[in-house]
């Protein structure tokens, strides 16, 4: 898989929060490509050397996944072709909080965006009338 490295594509993320013990979503979108096989998604976390998640050639590639995320991540594979690189994080842990990078490579070029992910015990406020 080769790209010049000189072209950049637009990648957009949204800061979000996850409830400990529940599933969370790290949102990321990008300029879509025509061919799914030309899209690479890499999720990284600040200070962690292994990957959070990698998706390439139309499927997950988890050989370089960091141990702390093993078995807990997934992308929405059927939505990658339309530019959705969001990550589903299962069983959110307190230690999942931090800065993440969504890194995208397509035939058009590459791009990335960071997002802050907060974790905690959040609850919906009750409204009494």
């Amino acid at each position: 898989f080769g790209i010049s490295g000189r072209h950049s594509i637009t990648v957009t993320t949204v800061a979000s929060a996850g409830n400990i013990g529940e599933d969370g979503i790290l949102s990321c979108t990008f300029e879509p490509d025509i061919k799914l096989s030309d899209i690479v998604i890499q999720w990284l976390k600040e200070g962690v050397l292994g990957l959070v998640h990698e998706f390439k050639e139309g499927k997950d590639e988890l050989s370089e996944q960091d141990e702390m995320f093993r078995g807990r991540t997934a992308v929405f594979a059927d939505q990658v072709i339309v530019g959705n690189a969001s990550l589903r994080l299962k069983n959110v842990q307190l230690t999942d909080a931090g800065t993440y990078k969504c890194y995208i490579i397509t035939s058009k070029g590459k791009g990335n965006a960071n997002l802050e992910y907060k974790t905690g015990a959040f609850s919906m406020p009750e409204v009494n009338v």
Epitope: F1, G5, V40, E46, G47, V48, L49, I105
Partner: antibody, heavy 121, light 107 residues
Framework: EVQLLESGGGLVQPGGSLRLSCAAS????????MHWVRQAPGKGLEWVSA????????YYADSVKGRFTISRDISKNTLYLQMNSLRAEDTAVYYC??????????????WGQGTTVTVSS | DIQMTQSPSSLSASVGDRVTITCRAS??????LAWYQQKPGKAPKLLIY???TLQSGVPSRFSGSGSGTDFTLTISSLQPEDFATYYC?????????FGGGTKVEIK
């Protein structure tokens, strides 16, 4: 000024132990992954070990796995390498190095001056 | 483990020459590649990261290119202070691995 200063090297017999330290200053220590890299006399660079910014994840070269332990004390801004069951082939200059940026995909931008470990009887 | 093969292992060049060093990874590392310069008795110095990004303070005569498995470090006009050993290093996969080094000597 961003600085790394190693200490703890010396002469040790085969089978012995040493603990290397790397004192960091001038940057936020707990946001950077840190590495140990070594260089045997007249040889090239060999990556030894690394630790995540939080200290929660550690990584080792196969040649040192089970013998070396990397750790960090964020309160002291110090990185450590505990080396046990030392062998002659562990003889090298040991460098600590900081990961550039906050993620794993870049190189090592700040290096210490190195500390020499000699394993010999 | 990913193997990094650097070539040549040594070269002789003159001041003002254009010098090219290549590095090949045993499998794709995208652009997760750095280049270092090391002088005798000194710690390595980061020159290039992300395959082609020049580290702050490094002269613009140094440039990097490539992605996937094949990478190049180019010194456009060799200066006296550039005589040193150069290493490539991949950071896509642990264990991180270095190339064997290229010693640039004075012709």
């Amino acid at each position: 000024e961003v600085q790394l200063l190693e200490s703890g090297g010396g002469l040790v017999q085969p089978g012995g132990s040493l603990r290397l330290s790397c004192a960091a200053s001038g940057f936020t220590f707990n946001t950077h992954a840190m590495h140990w890299v070594r260089q045997a006399p007249g040889k090239g660079l060999e990556w030894v070990s690394a630790i995540s910014g939080s200290g929660g994840s550690t990584y080792y070269a196969d040649s040192v796995k089970g013998r070396f332990t990397i750790s960090r004390d964020i309160s002291k801004n110090t990185l450590y390498l505990q080396m046990n069951s030392l062998r002659a082939e562990d003889t090298a200059v040991y460098y600590c190095a900081r990961l550039l940026g906050r993620f794993g995909e870049y190189g090592m931008d700040v290096w210490g001056q190195g500390t020499t470990v000699t394993v010999s009887s | 483990d990913i193997q990094m093969t650097q070539s040549p292992s040594s070269l002789s060049a003159s001041v003002g020459d254009r010098v090219t060093i290549t590095c090949r990874a045993s499998r794709s590392i995208y652009t997760w590649l750095a280049w270092y310069q090391q002088k005798p008795g000194k710690a390595p110095k980061l020159l290039i990261y992300d395959a082609s990004t020049l580290q702050s303070g490094v002269p613009s005569r140094f440039s990097g290119s490539g992605s996937g498995t094949d990478f190049t470090l180019t010194i456009s006009s060799l200066q006296p202070e550039d005589f040193a050993t150069y290493y490539c290093q991949q950071s896509y996969s642990t264990p991180y691995t270095f190339g064997g080094g290229t010693k640039v000597e004075i012709k």
